[in-house]
Interface confidence: low
C-alpha cells in the first residue's frame, strides 16, 4: 500500500465576475500555511453562468436567484463541505453594471440587492457584491498576471514556468478587453505621471510599483460594435447598412431601440425614420478598420501623449499580457502565436473578413452564429485598438502575449481581487520563503 500524505490544510475562495455579457464563477484554492507566498493560489474551476450579464436582469430581478443556482451548486460540490463556512464569496460587477448605474442608480442598486440576497442563501462566507471601478479592474488584472508569472517573487527560477516568462523581475503590462470596457495597465519607464487619475502606487512583497492604468468605458468589443453601428447608421441613406465589418452575404436585422438602449451610443443618437435596419455584410477589412478608427478621437490631447479621447498614455514599456476577449478572439482566429507578426495578423484578418458568410458558417459549424458573425469586427477592433488606440507598432507588437491561462488559472481581474480582499499579498517580503514554493504555482 502507498503511504498516504498527511491531509493538507487547503483554503478556498470564490469570485463571481459579473461582466457585461455573462457571469463567470471562479473557485481558487491554496495551502493555508503558504498564503503569503507568491504564486501559490490557483484556480480549480470556472463555471460559466448560463444567460446574459446581470445588468440584463433589470426588468426581471426575480430570475436572478435561478440564474446563479447552477454555478453556486457547482461550488458546493467542488469545495469540501467542511470548508463551506470559511470560504469567502465575492461578486464584482464591471462595465455592464457601470453603464446601468449611469442610466439609473436605483435600478443598479436593485439588481445588486437581489444578487446579494441570492448569494446570502448559500452556506459560504458571502462578502458582498459591488460594482468595481475601471481602475480596480485594470489594477487587479495586472496583479493577477504578474502574480501568476511569479514577477513578485524575489527568487530567480532556473527554469521558466511559461514560454514567455523571463527570469527578470520586470512586470508585464496588462491588456484586458471585455464586452463593455477595456483596460490598459503597466509600469511606465518614467515614474512621474502627468495624470494623477491614472496613477496607482502599490507596495507588494517589499517592492514599490508605480502603475499607470486606464479603463475605457464603452470600448469593450460589444459596446464598440454598438457605437460603430450607431455612428454608421447616421449616414445610411435608408434602412440598409452595408457594413464592411461583417462577412459578404451576412444579413441581420437590428432594432433601433436596441441600438440606442446603451449609454455608449448616446453621442451618436439621432432620430431615424425607421425602427429597424438591416446590416448587410460586405467583408472589407480596410474599410472596417477605417470605420473603427472613427470611434477614437485622436485630435485632442492635453498631455504629452494620449491614447484617444484625450486620455493620457505614457510611452509603452516592456511586455504585455493581453487576456480576456483579446485572447478569446485572437485564439479563435488562430493568431495568438508569438511567431505571427503584426503584418501577418493584418493579412490574415483581410482574408478572414472577405470570406463569404456561407463559407464561414460551414467552416465553423459548431460555433454559435451570433458569435461567429462578430469575429471579423472583433479582430479588426482589437488591431485598431492596439495599434492606433494604444500606439503599439509592428515592432512592439512582438511584446504582446495573448494569454488565456497561466498555469491553469485564467488571466483576468478576479484572482487579483481575491488576493487583495483576503490580504494574501503582503506589502513586505515574508521573512522565510519555503523552498517548495514553485510546486504550488
Amino acid at each position: 500500500t502507498q503511504n498516504k500524505a498527511l491531509p493538507e490544510n487547503i483554503k478556498y475562495g470564490i469570485v463571481l465576475d459579473a461582466g457585461s455579457s455573462h457571469t463567470s464563477l471562479y473557485i481558487y484554492k491554496w495551502p493555508a500555511e503558504k498564503e503569503n507566498d507568491t504564486g501559490v493560489v490557483h484556480q480549480v474551476e470556472e463555471c460559466r453562468v448560463k444567460g446574459p450579464g446581470i445588468s440584463k436582469y433589470v426588468q426581471k430581478v426575480n430570475e436572478i436567484g435561478i440564474y446563479l443556482t447552477d454555478c453556486m451548486e457547482r461550488a458546493r460540490e467542488v469545495i469540501p463541505r467542511s470548508q463551506h463556512q470559511e470560504t469567502p464569496v465575492y461578486l464584482g460587477a464591471t462595465a455592464g453594471m457601470r453603464l446601468l448605474r449611469m442610466e439609473s442608480e436605483e435600478l443598479a442598486d436593485r439588481v445588486l440587492d437581489v444578487v446579494e440576497r441570492s448569494l446570502s442563501n448559500y452556506p459560504f462566507d458571502f462578502q458582498g457584491a459591488r460594482i468595481i471601478t475601471g481602475q480596480e479592474e485594470g489594477a487587479y488584472g495586472w496583479i493577477t498576471i504578474n502574480y501568476l508569472l511569479g514577477k513578485f517573487s524575489q527568487k530567480t527560477r532556473w527554469f521558466s514556468i511559461v514560454p514567455y516568462e523571463t527570469n527578470n523581475q520586470e512586470t508585464f503590462g496588462a491588456l484586458d478587453l471585455g464586452g463593455a470596457s477595456t483596460q490598459i495597465t503597466f509600469v511606465p519607464q518614467n515614474q512621474t505621471t502627468e495624470s494623477p487619475d491614472n496613477a496607482l502606487q502599490f507596495r507588494l512583497y517589499g517592492k514599490d510599483y508605480n502603475v499607470y492604468t486606464h479603463s475605457f468605458l464603452c470600448y469593450g468589443k460589444d459596446q464598440a460594435l454598438w457605437q460603430k453601428l450607431a455612428k454608421d447608421i447616421q449616414v445610411a441613406s435608408n434602412e440598409i447598412l452595408r457594413d464592411p465589418c461583417f462577412h459578404p452575404g451576412y444579413k441581420k436585422v437590428v432594432n433601433v431601440s436596441d441600438l440606442y438602449k446603451t449609454p455608449c451610443t448616446k453621442r451618436f443618437e439621432m432620430t431615424l425614420p425607421f425602427q429597424q435596419f438591416e446590416i448587410q455584410g460586405i467583408g472589407n477589412y480596410q474599410q472596417c478598420h477605417q470605420s473603427v478608427l472613427e470611434l477614437f478621437n485622436t485630435s485632442y490631447c492635453p498631455y504629452s501623449q494620449c491614447a484617444f479621447n484625450g486620455i493620457f498614455l505614457p510611452p509603452l514599456q516592456g511586455d504585455f499580457g493581453a487576456f480576456s476577449a483579446f485572447y478569446f478572439v485572437m485564439n479563435f482566429l488562430n493568431l495568438t502565436s508569438e511567431k505571427v507578426s503584426q503584418e501577418k495578423v493584418t493579412e490574415m484578418m483581410k482574408k478572414f473578413c472577405s470570406q463569404p458568410w456561407e463559407e464561414i458558417k460551414t467552416s465553423y459549424a459548431g460555433v454559435k452564429e451570433k458569435y461567429l458573425s462578430e469575429y471579423c469586427f472583433s479582430g479588426t477592433y482589437i488591431l485598431s485598438l492596439l495599434l492606433q488606440g494604444y500606439h503599439f507598432t509592428a515592432d512592439s507588437w512582438e511584446h504582446i502575449h495573448f494569454i488565456g491561462k497561466i498555469q491553469g488559472s485564467d488571466a483576468g481581474w478576479t484572482l487579483g481581487y481575491m488576493l487583495n480582499l483576503t490580504n494574501m499579498i503582503p506589502a513586505e517580503q515574508p521573512l522565510s520563503t519555503p523552498l517548495s514554493h514553485s510546486t504550488y504555482v
Epitope: Q234, R267, E269, M270, T271, E294, N297, Y300
Partner: antibody, heavy 120, light 113 residues
Framework: QVQLVQSGAEVKKPGSSVKVSCKAS????????ISWVRQAPGQGLEWMGG??????NYAQKFQGRVTITADESTSTAYMELSSLRSEDTAVYYC???????????????WGQGTTVTVSS | GIVMTQSPDSLAVSLGERATINCKSS????????????LAWYQQKPGQPPKLLIY???TRASGVPDRFSGSGSGTDFTLTISSLQAEDVAVYYC?????????FGGGTKVEIK
C-alpha cells in the same frame, strides 16, 4: 450654461469664400452638435448643415459649397461658404442641436449671428 | 425633404387675447419608438437670434412663460399664446428635426391689433 460666441461681420466679394467661427464655452464641446442656420434679409430661417463628433452633414442646397468643421481643442466650430454670390448676403447663426445628432430638444442655444455681406 | 407650411403668414391680436399659429408637415414627424413628435417652435424678435420656445411639439423650454403652449401630433401642430403680451411681438417659426435636411416653416409674424 453653454454660450456660443460668433466671429464678427464680414464683407466679401462675389466668388470669394467666408469662414465664420462659433466658440462654445461653459459645456463639454465634444458633446455639442452644432448646426448652422442662415437668414437672408427679411426672409425666414434656413438650415445649412451641422457637425457633431467629427461628422458633418449638409443640406442638399449647399452641398459642395459649404464646409463645416470643429476644433475640439479650442471648442470652436467653423462654417466656410465658398463661391459667394450676392444672394448669400445673410445673417449666419450657429446653434446647439439639430444636425445628425438629433438635437432632441431642438436648437436650444444660439450664437449672436454673423452678418455676411456679399457685394462687388 | 419634409416641407413645413405655417399659417397664417401674419396675425394681429389684441393684448390679452389668444393667438394661434398652425404648422403642417408634409409627412409625420412622430417617432413611434419613443412616441415623440420631433417638432420645435422658435420666437425671433428683430435683430436677435431665434429663441427656442417648445420642443417635442408640446414641451416648454426652460424659462418660457406658461402662456406659450404647443399641441398636435403627426403632421398638424399648433402654437398658442393664451394671453398676448406686448413683448410677444415677434416672428414665430416651427421646425422639424425628424429627418434631414432639418426644415423650418416660413414664419408667422405676430403683431398687436
Amino acid at each position: 450654461q453653454v454660450q456660443l460666441v460668433q466671429s464678427g461681420a464680414e464683407v466679401k466679394k462675389p466668388g470669394s469664400s467666408v469662414k465664420v467661427s462659433c466658440k462654445a464655452s461653459g459645456g463639454t464641446f465634444s458633446s455639442l452638435p452644432i448646426s448652422w442656420v442662415r437668414q437672408a434679409p427679411g426672409q425666414g430661417l434656413e438650415w445649412m448643415g451641422g457637425i457633431g463628433f467629427g461628422t458633418a452633414n449638409y443640406a442638399q442646397k449647399f452641398q459642395g459649397r459649404v464646409t463645416i468643421t470643429a476644433d475640439e481643442s479650442t471648442s470652436t466650430a467653423y462654417m466656410e461658404l465658398s463661391s459667394l454670390r450676392s444672394e448669400d448676403t445673410a445673417v449666419y447663426y450657429c446653434a446647439r442641436g439639430g444636425a445628425k445628432y438629433a438635437g432632441r430638444y431642438g436648437m436650444d442655444v444660439w450664437g449672436q449671428g454673423t452678418t455676411v455681406t456679399v457685394s462687388s | 425633404g419634409i416641407v413645413m407650411t405655417q399659417s397664417p403668414d401674419s396675425l394681429a391680436v389684441s393684448l390679452g387675447e389668444r393667438a394661434t399659429i398652425n404648422c403642417k408637415s408634409s409627412q409625420s414627424v412622430l417617432f413611434s419608438s419613443n412616441n415623440k413628435n420631433y417638432l420645435a417652435w422658435y420666437q425671433q424678435k428683430p435683430g436677435q437670434p431665434p429663441k427656442l420656445l417648445i420642443y417635442w411639439a408640446s414641451t416648454r423650454a426652460s424659462g418660457v412663460p406658461d402662456r406659450f403652449s404647443g399641441s398636435g401630433s403627426g403632421t398638424d401642430f399648433t402654437l398658442t399664446i393664451s394671453s398676448l403680451q406686448a413683448e410677444d411681438v415677434a416672428v414665430y417659426y416651427c421646425q422639424q428635426y425628424y429627418l434631414y435636411p432639418l426644415t423650418f416653416g416660413g414664419g408667422t409674424k405676430v403683431e398687436i391689433k
